[in-house]
């Protein structure tokens, strides 16, 4: 495939990535799948600068990101290393809280109303952000 040089319609370009901001809510897995079907992934935050950009666009609304610990360790959906990477948890988070009464703990990360991160029940219907890299080869066949 050819390299994508422009962001798709309704996506926002920033620092060689394209971002799409939902206005409805989905469970984390459904949001993850939505982004994959768009040849993208849930947003992976790698810097304070990117954090501020996303925060500016989502406003004070709970919004899923591409970080989860459903299979054990915290993992970014694109393989970015959690241990050495950027983190912006709220104080005392993540806490894998069991007190919500929904069964199990909290395995999916989201931006909170102040932009800092919290872990929550993955089934909650939050807004989400998709991201795709401009330099990534697109799935479209090259023009002959």
């Amino acid at each position: 495939g050819s390299e994508r040089t422009c962001c798709p319609v309704n996506w926002v370009e920033h620092e060689r990535s394209c971002y799409w901001f939902s206005r409805s809510g989905k469970a984390w897995a459904d949001a993850d799948n939505y982004c994959r079907l768009e040849d993208a992934h849930l947003v992976v935050v790698t810097s304070w600068e990117e954090q501020k950009f996303v925060q500016h666009h989502i406003g004070p609304v709970n919004t899923w990101m591409g970080l989860h610990d459903q299979n054990g360790p915290w993992k970014w959906v694109d393989g970015t290393d959690y241990e050495t990477g950027f983190k912006n948890w709220r104080p005392e988070q993540p806490d894998d809280w069991y007190g919500h009464g929904l069964g199990g703990g909290e395995d999916c990360a989201h931006f909170t109303d102040d932009g800092r991160w919290n872990d929550d029940v993955c089934q909650r219907p939050y807004r989400w952000v998709c991201e795709t890299e401009l330099d990534k080869a697109s799935q479209e066949p090259p023009l002959l």
Partner: antibody, heavy 114, light 107 residues
């Protein structure tokens, strides 16, 4: 590489106390809840306590409530289990484990006997 | 508290056999269940998480299924290194509870 190393086990008399430690490395310790699980000789596994990443939430099995105290020091990447009023039935290998049990230490043996 | 009833408590099998172990929860636990393998003198090792997902590095002959109250661990073709004791663990609510264990022995 994720590593959990328990220490502090040994022989103690009934009614005595012991403090177990679990030294963690290879992962961001404060991002994970931690647990203590024990196994009496020839018996099955028994969950005994959990603590959230910041220490805000703590849970105990009824069998140890009021006698054991779980704690953590995130600055030292360490998990602890303070065991008081020990009984013969507390004799077991004690394991520390991360969150829902995706990684375990090798265990430390606690023997309560007169 | 949620009780986990595991069966059988032991079984004898031969290399190549298909083996199935069951855990039943006393109330619904969604898919908040893991399966663990333990060999003598060693720490438990997680094989399956959230009832049906294979832990990284675990051979594909191990599989898990179930949701709610009935859960199954299957070994499709038993290998010499699979002779061990297996436990289920529910982490849906505190106190977390293990099944009683199933010892898989060589026939």
């Amino acid at each position: 590489e994720v590593q959990l190393v328990e220490s502090g086990g040994g022989l103690v008399k009934p009614g005595g106390s012991l403090r177990l430690s679990c030294a963690a490395s290879g992962f961001t310790f404060s991002s994970y809840g931690m647990n203590w699980v024990r196994q009496a000789p020839g018996k099955g596994l028994e969950w005994i306590s959990s603590i959230s990443g910041s220490g805000s939430y703590i849970y105990y099995a009824d069998s140890v409530k009021g006698r054991f105290t779980i704690s953590r020091d995130n600055a030292k990447n360490s998990l602890y289990l303070q065991m008081n009023s020990l009984r013969a039935e507390d004799t077991a290998v004690y394991y520390c484990a991360i969150s829902s049990g995706w990684s375990w230490g090798q265990g430390t043996l606690v023997t309560v006997s007169s | 508290d949620i009780q986990m009833t595991q069966s059988p408590s032991s079984l004898s099998a031969s290399v190549g056999d298909r083996v199935t172990i069951t855990c039943r929860a006393s109330q619904g636990i969604r898919n908040d269940l893991g399966w663990y393998q333990q060999k003598p003198g060693k720490a438990p090792k997680r094989l399956i998480y959230t009832a049906s997902n294979l832990q990284s590095g675990v051979p594909s002959r191990f599989s898990g299924s179930g949701c709610g109250t009935e859960f199954t661990l299957t070994v499709s073709s038993l290998q010499p290194e699979d002779f061990a004791t297996y436990y289920c663990l529910q982490h849906n609510s505190y106190p977390w509870t293990f099944g009683q264990g199933t010892k898989v022995e060589i026939k």
